[in-house]
């Protein structure tokens, strides 16, 4: 029986050009975490596998850093990064738990008001 729950940062916002940490935490279960996937609806960003370590998708290699922990740091944000991110915890013996984070990337205040200077 799956007793665990995923806690996430929920809805977050960050400025264009900045960075953000995507973080999930699995609680209320003694199941062993064997792999964590970080995905968008249409593509995988990264996998942290207990045996194989980290794999970062080539599409994100230049601006995704593993960690902290099982989290993911997304750098050099663009407005196209706005959207939903999924942390998928593969566990034994429970199975798979999924959490979601909605990221909104905002135009930076410098960019917004740059024309005034």
């Amino acid at each position: 029986m799956m007793t665990g729950t995923i806690e996430t940062t929920g809805n977050i916002s960050a400025e264009k050009g900045g960075s953000i940490i995507l973080q999930c935490h699995l609680s209320s279960t003694t199941a062993q975490v064997t792999q964590v996937n970080w995905e968008q609806q249409d593509q995988l960003l990264a996998i942290c596998n207990a045996d194989l370590g980290w794999h970062i998708s080539p599409s994100f290699k230049d601006r995704v850093a593993p960690g902290p922990g099982l989290g993911l740091t997304l750098q050099s944000l663009t407005v196209n990064d706005t959207g939903e991110y999924f942390c998928i915890y593969h566990t034994y013996p429970d199975g798979t738990y999924t959490g979601r984070i909605f990221l909104e990337v905002l135009e930076s205040s410098v960019a917004e008001h740059g024309a005034r200077f």
């Epitope: 609806q41 593509q43 995988l44 996998i47 596998n49 794999h55 998708s57 998928i88 593969h90």
Partner: antibody, heavy 118, light 107 residues
Framework: QVQLQESGPGLVKPSQTLSLTCTVT?????????WNWIRQPPGKGLEWMGY???????RYNPSLKSRVTISRDTSKNQFSLKLSSVTAEDTATYYC???????????WGQGTLVTVSS | DIVMTQSHSFLSASVGDRVSITCKAS??????VAWYQQKPGQAPELLIY???YRYTGVPDRFTGSGSGTDFTLTISSLQAEDVAVYYC?????????FGQGTKLEMK
Amino acid sequence: QVQLQESGPGLVKPSQTLSLTCTVTGYSITSDYAWNWIRQPPGKGLEWMGYISYSGSARYNPSLKSRVTISRDTSKNQFSLKLSSVTAEDTATYYCARKGYPAYFAYWGQGTLVTVSS
Amino acid sequence: DIVMTQSHSFLSASVGDRVSITCKASQDVSTAVAWYQQKPGQAPELLIYSASYRYTGVPDRFTGSGSGTDFTLTISSLQAEDVAVYYCQHHYSTPYTFGQGTKLEMK
């Protein structure tokens, strides 16, 4: 439990538009997941065509160019496939399926055979 | 697009045999591979996802392994009801693609 059921004409004429609908029971298509179309020509392998996500955004297989459109009717808990300018090569069994996290297909309709012929 | 290649279109084995079906991805997909079983006239059924995780209700004689580009589905002791076509699929990014299938027959 989640069930998917394809419906639509079994015969379509060349150059016309193929239209199929998938009715989902046991789960709201606006709650979560992405809702896909996958086809299989007779005696051949599987081809992913595209999906519409629970939020309404669609993604298509570039191999089908701009011939494919997936839409939804949330009031009926249905999603639909339109494939334009069909030829005999589009003859296939068409399946609707739910994509999970990660992107595997755990729930499928039983499939419907569509023949393209004059 | 990522191409998934199953080296054997057909495999023949006897009840009780250990059977391995292989699949190769055209690029590194880490562990993002699923396996399906399809019996005649039926929709595919999910067996394995993320290379090695057995889907709910799948008998434990089915095991998935591999990472990177090379993946294997193993049936530890073949049963008569395992006669089917087996497909691999990458779930790395869209467009999702499938192998051409391996038809498993009884000797």
